[in-house]
């Protein structure tokens, strides 16, 4: 869909990984003065929310409140802007945003080889494992928007494992991993315990915790 206006942006506050029963704000914004914003969940016939746009300092936006989080609210979301209503004349869609529900299954274990403290330039591999038969493991790093995904290997010594080669270490960070099943890609386990990887012999050996943008004020439209 080309759209009569350029695509708006779609952000999740505090982030796209949402614990079961918690709420996430999906903020759709644009520098085009849209009167209306629509939020649509991919593949669903009746999952389109509508909000009147708020306008401040040349930006129009809408805050959609999604929650309390359940399995059937997870999925791929896109938002659209429209200057008209009935009929809508929709903009191009925002980039897709995957909203994932976490906290559904037992947490995997996360470890580092050769260890969580490495010399700068030394190769490090993170291993995520569980006795649960997860098909997929997801590695997230604090402050990064996207997770890395690896298929779990065959069962070895009673556990299913995936190895994430991080390559030569340049700077550290706090990592977590999650497990999921092939048939439910938006439904993840509890987070592993966080693992702090430190790099020595390197000036940037600490990874700053990201400052989360605050949820914008206004009346969010709820999906529950």
């Amino acid at each position: 869909h080309e759209g009569v206006h350029r695509k708006p942006s779609l952000l999740a506050h505090p982030g796209p990984l949402v614990k079961s029963e918690e709420t996430v704000i999906l903020q759709c914004w644009s520098d085009v003065r849209f009167q209306h914003f629509l939020l649509h969940r991919e593949g669903k016939f009746k999952d389109t929310l509508h909000l009147i746009g708020e306008h401040h300092d040349g930006v129009s936006k809408a805050n959609f409140s999604i929650g309390p989080m359940m399995q059937d609210l997870a999925g791929t979301y896109r938002c659209y802007g429209s200057v008209t209503h009935s009929p809508y004349q929709l903009s191009a869609p925002s980039d897709p945003l995957d909203i994932v529900i976490t906290g559904l299954y037992e947490k995997p274990s996360l470890s580092a080889q050769p260890g969580p403290t490495v010399l700068a330039g030394e190769s490090v591999t993170l291993s995520c494992s569980s006795r649960s038969s997860y098909d997929m493991y997801h590695l997230s790093r604090e402050g990064e928007a996207h997770e890395r995904r690896f298929s779990a290997g065959p069962k070895v010594n009673g556990t299913f494992q995936a190895d994430f080669p991080l390559g030569p270490a340049t700077h550290g960070g706090t990592y977590r991993c999650f497990g999921s099943f092939r048939d439910s890609p938006y439904e993840w386990s509890n987070s592993s315990d966080p693992l702090l990887v430190s790099v020595t012999g390197n000036p940037s050996n600490s990874w700053p915790s990201p400052t989360e943008p605050s949820s914008e004020t206004g009346n969010p439209r709820h999906l529950h």
Epitope: H1, L38, H40, E42, G43, K44, F45, K46, T48, L49, H50, D72, R78, S86, P87, Y88, Q89, L90, H224
Partner: antibody, heavy 120, light 113 residues
Framework: QVQLVQSGAGVKKPGSSVKVSCKAS????????ISWVRQAPGQGLEWMGG????????NYAQNFQGRVTITADESRNTAYMELSSLRSEDTAMYYC?????????????WGQGTLVTVSS | QSVLTQPPSVSGAPGQRVTISCTGS?????????VHWYQQLPGTAPKLLIY???NRPSGVPDRFSGSKSGTSASLAITGLQAEDEADYYC????????????FGGGTKVTVLA
């Protein structure tokens, strides 16, 4: 005023397929949801599935999953419903109906209906 | 067997008030999904009568009203007229595996002479 104009009635053999069209005249088509609803003789209404062309979304009722395909051609302002493996109990009036994007199941405009008879 | 349950028929004399009930479950009406009502005159396509539980499209007389409570909804017709003789269907959305859009089985309203 938008109207939904459907293709004409037809008689089909058991095991064959039927494709019914629904053209929106007098207004835009893509910024709405289009559903297909059928009504067997003397019976109630049954939702078969729907499409939201602008989102590329089609959904089907469980009863029809695998037998029905709903498509849309935005350039022709036309939606289509194809039902395969026809049996005698598929003899019915088939309606297309329009809903808003946000309320796709509140059908504010209906086609005139297309009678499909399945008979050997 | 319809997902939403309606009485097969109701009747009333001209000028009377009749109500049609529509009973659902926790996966449709009780889940907070809106209820819509349609009127189908003999030999014609259905027509939207009430949307969003209680809203009338333009052109629908205010003799028709809708309400919703819990897992059920109802349609009331006051000042019944001969031209109200028709089939009436309630409709909602269902989040269970049974499908998406669901209808009641329909209620035949007869206006007694």
């Amino acid at each position: 005023q938008v109207q939904l104009v459907q293709s004409g009635a037809g008689v089909k053999k058991p095991g064959s397929s039927v494709k019914v069209s629904c053209k929106a005249s007098g207004g835009t088509f893509s910024s709405y949801a289009i559903s297909w609803v059928r009504q067997a003789p003397g019976q109630g209404l049954e939702w078969m599935g729907g499409i939201i062309p602008i989102f590329g979304t089609s959904n089907y009722a469980q009863n029809f999953q695998g037998r029905v395909t709903i498509t849309a051609d935005e350039s022709r302002n036309t939606a289509y419903m194809e039902l395969s493996s026809l049996r005698s109990e598929d003899t019915a009036m088939y309606y297309c109906a329009r809903g808003e994007l946000v309320d796709p199941d509140a059908f504010d405009i209906w086609g005139q209906g297309t009678l499909v008879t399945v008979s050997s | 067997q319809s997902v939403l349950t309606q009485p097969p028929s109701v009747s009333g004399a001209p000028g009377q008030r009749v109500t049609i009930s529509c009973t659902g479950s926790s996966s449709n009406i009780g889940a907070g999904y809106d209820v819509h009502w349609y009127q189908q005159l003999p030999g014609t396509a259905p027509k939207l009568l009430i949307y969003g539980n209680s809203n009338r499209p333009s052109g629908v007389p205010d003799r028709f009203s809708g309400s919703k409570s819990g897992t059920s909804a109802s349609l009331a017709i006051t000042g019944l007229q001969a031209e109200d003789e028709a089939d009436y269907y309630c409709q909602s959305y269902d989040s269970s595996l049974s499908g998406y859009v669901v209808f009641g089985g329909g209620t035949k309203v007869t206006v007694l002479a």
